[in-house]
């Protein structure tokens, strides 16, 4: 029978007599930076080229006995998870190993840097097809290690790393905290976060997604035919490296941004029990478990978007938080969230020639998050239209007036400390799909985009008495680009997108003592690209993703 | 994911006049910074990655490394250049006393210096 972890990442259409998905990643080379490995193990023989790269510290302790099988244990297992004949994810992928961890599984930031440099030089000397670099290691936050990862990613290399096994915020570790790296947490057979002794998988906004990482069967260095079960975020990262190799083999021209969006899109949604995570991390941690796409064809017809949370602003009165999209993603909307509800909204602004999302803390607030909706929208031309606070008693409004531009997101930002005390409430004008409205004391920012075949519509869901949470989702075939709340009063904590659902959180009315009867409305902007759909159908005849992908559309409520 | 340089220990050494006139002052208004791992047991003092500004050429990296060695020697310190980086980041890896950090941070082209630290299999 197929191991649980391979079954979990395999879409139903592949679950035939045995696990043998089409194309095993044969066009892709996966670099593994780890311990030494037993490259002639039956599971991986001929699949792993051991490079002559070695940069490891001496083992600790005078009584340490170097035992070959122990030295090779971690790396051999991971090589097997990525490309093993019987228990591997990408059975056709070829691998190259670099030794940066010693027999105790310990290495250095400097050794890892030199390893990454070795890969870059190899790539320049002999350019091959797509490269995936697997970093199943973690240290403390390192500016230099993150910078090296960024440079390698910008050279077209896909880096996948372990989130870390410290039951902690992954942003405190490197390379897990590098934005360009795909950071993977670990889940078990019950889709629960993995517990490892007193610790467990890391979590938080620096994790991109989770993957199987407990009781993973793979090659054991104890003998040439042995298998062993190992657990950790390294094993989870190895699954994603394998999935990435499969995807890149099917579509070798995919960019890092496109690959990351596809990994997120094809993940199982909302299956992880979030109660395991600390309360303040639940909203920040992606509820995604990696899976292979249900088809080897591209998914080019889809408009892909993901949600990127900023670091916490900190509590000072003028503190701000910034969320950024990857270089080849478009920022289509910007929202903000504060656990205390004390915030002054958010705005999209240009920084270094690119739009960023900035959220503003308010006096007495514990801090805010900025939440960017980052999308793949080829040939897009996006701009921000701003309306200053209105003088009139009605609300502020702004719309996309340029020909062919459509509204993809609304933001509002205010200078007053508490909008809730400023009446009257905003009444949203109906039948204005290309218009953002807001409180008269707020400035309103509309994200307006022109892209071939782009069409968007506004969807709202209002609940009369304040609820802790209001959601509205986009229908099948449409992608959530914008998520905001109406009105921006003090009991609204903020709005954010989770998969294709817009979530508006409000303060628990029982604790605030508010008697406001004001409705809270979640406003979603849902878009699709007819251009992408047509281009994809011309390439493939027609796409077969739509029907098969239904099992991914669970909705995620916090 | 983490983008700013928060969430870890940063030591910014404010630099006064260029000591002994030996080091060229960094470009006006820029101060090289020193970083080290926030998790003390994982620190590896005595080995440092000196990261140079983005457009620095290999020859300048080598020259900067030699300059550091020469200035350290004048002060009676032994240093060893373990690796010169190029291809990903310009810079070099040096084994030296922490006493030399202030001197190293004043070298031309230096963007920041990071103390080496441990990484672990996960």
């Amino acid at each position: 029978s197929i191991p649980w972890n391979l079954e979990r990442i395999t879409p139903p259409r592949y679950r035939a007599d045995e696990y043998q998905p089409p194309d095993g990643g044969s066009l892709v080379e996966v670099y593994l930076l780890d311990t030494s490995i037993q490259s002639d193990h039956r599971e991986i023989e001929g699949r792993v080229m051991v490079t002559d790269f070695e940069n490891v510290p001496e083992e600790d302790g005078t009584r340490f006995h170097r035992q070959a099988s122990k030295c090779d244990s971690h790396g051999t297992h991971l090589a097997g998870v990525v490309s093993g004949r019987d228990a591997g994810v990408a059975k056709g992928a070829s691998m190259r190993s670099l030794r940066v961890l010693n027999c105790q599984g310990k290495g250095t930031v400097s050794g890892t840097l030199i390893g990454l440099e070795f890969i870059r030089k190899s790539q320049l000397v002999q350019p091959v097809g797509p490269l995936v670099v697997l970093l199943p290691l973690a240290g403390g936050y390192s500016r230099v290690l993150n910078a090296a990862c960024q440079r390698l990613a910008r050279a077209g290399v896909v880096l996948v790393t372990a989130a870390g096994n410290f039951r902690d915020d992954a942003c405190l570790y490197s390379p897990a905290s590098a934005p360009e790296v795909i950071t993977v947490g670990a889940t078990n057979a019950q889709d629960q976060p993995v517990t490892l002794g007193t610790l467990g998988t890391n979590f938080g906004r620096c994790v991109d997604l989770f993957a199987p990482g407990e009781d993973i069967i793979g090659a054991s260095s104890d003998c040439s035919t042995c298998f062993v079960s190992q657990s950790g975020t390294s094993q989870a990262a190895a699954h994603v490296a394998g999935i990435a190799a499969m995807m890149l083999s099917a579509e070798p021209e995919l960019t890092l941004a496109e690959l990351r969006q596809r990994l997120i899109h094809f993940s199982a949604k909302d299956v992880i029990n979030e109660a395991w995570f600390p309360e303040d991390q639940r909203v920040l941690t992606p509820n995604l478990v990696a899976a292979l796409p249900p088809s080897t064809h591209g998914a080019g017809w889809q408009l892909f978007c993901r949600t990127v949370w900023s670091a916490h602003s900190g509590p000072t009165r003028m503190a701000t938080a910034i969320a950024r999209c990857a270089p080849d993603e478009e920022l289509l909307s910007c929202s903000s969230f504060s656990r205390s509800g004390k915030r002054r909204g958010e705005r999209m602004e240009a920084q270094g020639g690119k739009l960023v999302c900035r959220a503003h803390n308010a006096f007495g607030g514990e801090g805010v998050y900025a939440i960017a909706r980052c999308c793949l929208l080829p040939q897009a031309n996006c701009s921000v239209h701003t309306a200053p606070p209105a003088e009139a008693s009605m609300g502020t409004e702004v719309h996309c007036h340029q020909q062919g531009h459509v509204l993809t997101g609304c933001s509002s930002h205010w200078e007053v400390e508490d909008l809730g005390t400023h009446k009257p409430p905003v009444l949203r004008p109906r039948g204005q799909p290309n218009q953002c409205v807001g409180h008269r004391e707020a400035s309103i920012h509309a994200s307006c985009c022109h892209a071939p075949g782009l069409e968007c519509k506004v969807k709202e869901h209002g609940i009369p008495a304040p609820q802790e949470q209001v959601t509205v989702a986009c229908e099948e075939g449409w992608t959530l680009t914008g998520c905001s709340a109406l009105p921006g009063t003090s009991h609204v904590l903020g709005a954010y997108a989770v998969d294709n659902t817009c979530v508006v959180r409000s303060r628990d009315v029982s604790t605030t003592g508010s008697t406001s009867e004001e409705a809270v409305t979640a406003v979603a902007i849902c878009c699709r690209s007819r251009h992408l759909a047509q281009a994809s159908q011309e390439l493939q005849g027609s796409s077969d993703y739509k029907d098969d992908d239904k099992h991914h559309h669970h909705h995620h409520h916090h | 994911q983490e983008d700013e340089d928060g969430d870890y220990e940063e030591l910014v050494l404010a630099l006064r006049s260029e000591e002994d006139g030996l080091a060229e002052a960094p470009e006006h208004g820029t101060t090289a910074t020193f970083h080290r791992c926030a998790k003390d047991p994982w620190r590896l003092p005595g080995t440092y990655v000196v990261v140079l500004k983005e457009e620095t050429h290999l020859s300048q990296s080598e020259r900067t490394a030699r300059r550091l060695q020469a200035q350290a020697a004048r002060r009676g310190y032994l240093t060893k250049i373990l690796h010169v980086f190029h291809g990903l980041l310009p810079g070099f890896l040096v084994k030296m006393s922490g006493d030399l950090l202030e001197l190293a941070l004043k070298l031309p082209h230096v963007d920041y210096i990071e103390e080496d630290s441990s990484v672990f299999a996960q």
């Epitope: 023989e45 080229m49 051991v50 070959a68 004949r85 019987d86 059975k91 003998c223 035919t225 | -």
Partner: antibody, heavy 115, light 110 residues
Framework: QVQLVQSGAEVKKPGASVKVSCKAS????????ISWVRQAPGQGLEWMGW????????NYAQKLQGRGTMTTDPSTSTAYMELRSLRSDDTAVYYC????????WGQGTTVTVSS | QSALTQPASVSGSPGQSITISCTGT?????????VSWYQQHPGKAPKLMIY???NRPSGVSNRFSGSKSGNTASLTISGLQAEDEADYYC?????????FGGGTKLTVLQ
């Protein structure tokens, strides 16, 4: 190109030992071990065992346990198979093949055990 | 462990297709993705024709194909040619070793 070159034919008396060599070339030695397979006259193929160039580890077929020894010498890229206490039913062609996948084979070494 | 079961002989005329079966257990053929097929002409070393159930090494004609269902693997040769006349052996992993089939003699009828 990838090649396995075996030593020449041997004629041995019952009770004696034989040591067959197999020199590998054209690939990264440590990525594959060497399998040994034999074929008695008019019979099928029989897997005897495997030996590692990486660390010298071995994996013997149960039938061979105790009578055979497989070794490697990475410095000369050569694998060896020694069979002791030879019997007449050990008369066979002995092949070395690359790895467990046995994708490349040596030309075979004929061992005749006869009194 | 005992050898995998193959038919002792099969035959076919030029241009025809033939299939050779290889039956094992869930501990060998059924339990692994690593079933291989070898061709051996008289007095020659075996040659790998199919590996990992259905993959063909470069240089092997696409007339040769492999498949597996449950505990039985199959080798199919289409468009039979005179030079295909040889002995064919299947091989599979077991938990700790390797096992061959007894071999099948393929005769191409003239």
């Amino acid at each position: 190109q990838v090649q396995l070159v075996q030593s020449g034919a041997e004629v041995k008396k019952p009770g004696a030992s034989v040591k067959v060599s197999c020199k590998a070339s054209g690939y990264t030695l440590t990525s594959y071990g060497i399998s040994w397979v034999r074929q008695a006259p008019g019979q099928g193929l029989e897997w005897m065992g495997w030996v590692s160039f990486y660390n010298g580890n071995t994996n013997y077929a149960q039938k061979l346990q105790g009578r055979g020894t497989m070794t490697t010498d990475p410095s000369t890229s050569t694998a060896y198979m020694e069979l002791r206490s030879l019997r007449s039913d050990d008369t066979a062609v002995y092949y070395c093949a690359r790895g467990y996948g046995m994708d490349v084979w040596g030309q075979g070494t004929t061992v005749t055990v006869s009194s | 462990q005992s050898a995998l079961t193959q038919p002792a002989s099969v035959s076919g005329s030029p241009g025809q297709s033939i299939t050779i079966s290889c039956t094992g257990t869930s501990s060998d053929v059924g339990g692994y993705n690593s079933v291989s097929w070898y061709q051996q002409h008289p007095g020659k070393a075996p040659k790998l024709m199919i590996y990992e159930v259905s993959n063909r090494p470069s240089g092997v004609s696409n007339r040769f194909s492999g498949s597996k269902s449950g505990n039985t693997a199959s080798l199919t040769i289409s468009g039979l040619q005179a030079e295909d006349e040889a002995d064919y052996y299947c091989n599979s992993y077991t938990s700790t070793s390797m096992v061959f089939g007894g071999g099948t003699k393929l005769t191409v009828l003239q």
